[in-house]
């Protein structure tokens, strides 16, 4: 069963700043994310932000910045101008819509014992991003390899029979020892949730790669098409018809400005869905 997790945290640097993190755990691609406060969307809640994978993001005060973190999670930064900090007692809700499969919503609030200086809230995503971990892992392997080579050279210096070049077989063995851990670490990092299993993200779930950003495919047969396809797509006259994934639109020639990180297009790692849902009219 698909699930939505919500985490609210206070920024350690600015006590008046809050961040709401929401994520979708389950199959299917997201067509729209709505963040509201004071209750669920459509049931007394007030919209703070709406994020669409192609159309971008819209937000309302006190929301400061809404953005996609991965293809199935978002974050919303809030600026609390009031001294009384009303966010502390507020419920934030996130709704993930996957048209036409269904929509899922969950709510959360700031934990009562939220001292940003003392306790860190549970992180629903791995603390170490997969790409960063890969770089660090590779660096570690290389450093280990260099150290090992130096160790061998030092041992050879102290040998009575001076032999500057290691044998061919030794060289091969060294190469194998240097690169095998790298491949193992990369395999371990292939699923970013493999080693960090929080209450929000079971390791058994099919999870998205935080670094899996890429543009959507643009070939025919009901593939989603977005701003990234403009290079290979003829420029559309105002009022022409375009049919793409999960959004109605009217003036094809008047798309909203595509700016900011929330506009990065990304494929569904489970394969693109055959969905055409946006339309343009005169």
């Amino acid at each position: 069963t698909p699930e939505v997790w919500v985490q609210v945290q206070m920024e350690a640097t600015e006590l008046s700043s809050f961040t709401v993190h929401c994520g979708f755990l389950g199959p299917g691609s997201i067509s729209l994310v709505t963040v509201s406060w004071g209750g669920p969307d459509g049931a007394g809640g007030t919209k703070l932000a709406v994020l669409h994978p192609e159309l971008g993001t819209r937000q309302w005060a006190p929301a400061r910045q809404a953005r996609w973190e991965t293809q199935s999670s978002i974050s919303l930064a809030l600026e609390d101008s009031g001294a009384s900090s009303p966010f502390a007692n507020t419920t934030f809700c996130c709704k993930f819509a996957s048209f036409p499969e269904g929509s899922w919503e969950s709510c959360g609030s700031l934990p009562p014992s939220s001292d940003p200086g003392l306790s860190a809230p549970p992180t629903p995503v791995p603390i170490l991003r997969a790409d960063l971990a890969g770089i660090l892992g590779l660096s570690g392997v290389l450093l280990f390899g260099c150290g090992y080579l130096l160790h061998l050279l030092r041992r050879q210096k102290h040998r009575p029979t001076p032999r500057l070049q290691p044998s061919h077989t030794n060289s091969q063995a060294l190469t194998a020892q240097a690169w095998a851990p790298s491949q193992a670490s990369q395999a371990a990092l292939h699923d970013p949730y493999a080693t960090i299993n929080t209450s929000f993200c079971p390791a058994t779930l099919d999870t998205a790669h935080p670094n899996g950003w890429a543009s959507l495919p643009t070939h025919a047969a009901h593939q989603p098409q977005g701003p990234a396809a403009s290079a290979s797509t003829p420029i559309l006259a105002r009022g022409s018809f375009v049919s793409v994934e999960n959004g109605l639109y009217t003036q094809a020639g008047e798309r909203p400005p595509h700016t900011g990180p929330g506009l990065t297009l990304f494929p569904d790692c489970r394969g693109p869905r055959a969905v055409e849902g946006r339309f343009g009219v005169r």
Epitope: G42, L55, N246
Partner: nanobody
Framework: EVQLVESGGGLVQPGGSLRLSCAAS????????MGWFRQAPGKGLEGVAH???????RYVDSVKGRFTISRDNAKNSLYLQMNSLRAEDTAVYYC???????????????WGQGTMVTVSS
């Protein structure tokens, strides 16, 4: 909770007419854009028409002049009058409540279970 219930689908001969209705509840009806999507058998979803809170209708080219979208805020209902139906109009029709992106964008946020429209002789 937002609820959308479509009705009015059925079997009709080419050239015939149908009127789809959508009863909506659980949200502020007058402030959201609403529309109709359809999904033909074995095909992808396609936007058909939508109407904003200002009442201005918008249509996909393939249905212009044949389909008419309207909404009744007092009854919390959305309608799609379909005339001169063709075989290619055969599909499951979904009523959607959308979020308006700028002036021209309406992305589905909630939708109904759909109603089947079959155009066949």
């Amino acid at each position: 909770e937002v609820q959308l219930v479509e009705s009015g689908g059925g079997l009709v001969q080419p050239g015939g007419s149908l009127r789809l209705s959508c009863a909506a509840s659980g949200f502020t009806f007058s402030t959201d854009c609403m529309g109709w999507f359809r999904q033909a058998p074995g095909k992808g979803l396609e936007g058909v028409a939508h109407i904003d809170s200002d009442g201005i209708p918008r249509y996909v080219d393939s249905v212009k002049g044949r389909f008419t979208i309207s909404r009744d805020n007092a009854k919390n209902s959305l309608y799609l009058q379909m005339n001169s139906l063709r075989a290619e109009d055969t599909a499951v029709y979904y009523c959607v409540v959308g979020f308006k992106f700028d002036e021209d964008y309406c992305a589905p946020n909630d939708w109904g279970q759909g109603t089947m429209v079959t155009v066949s002789s």
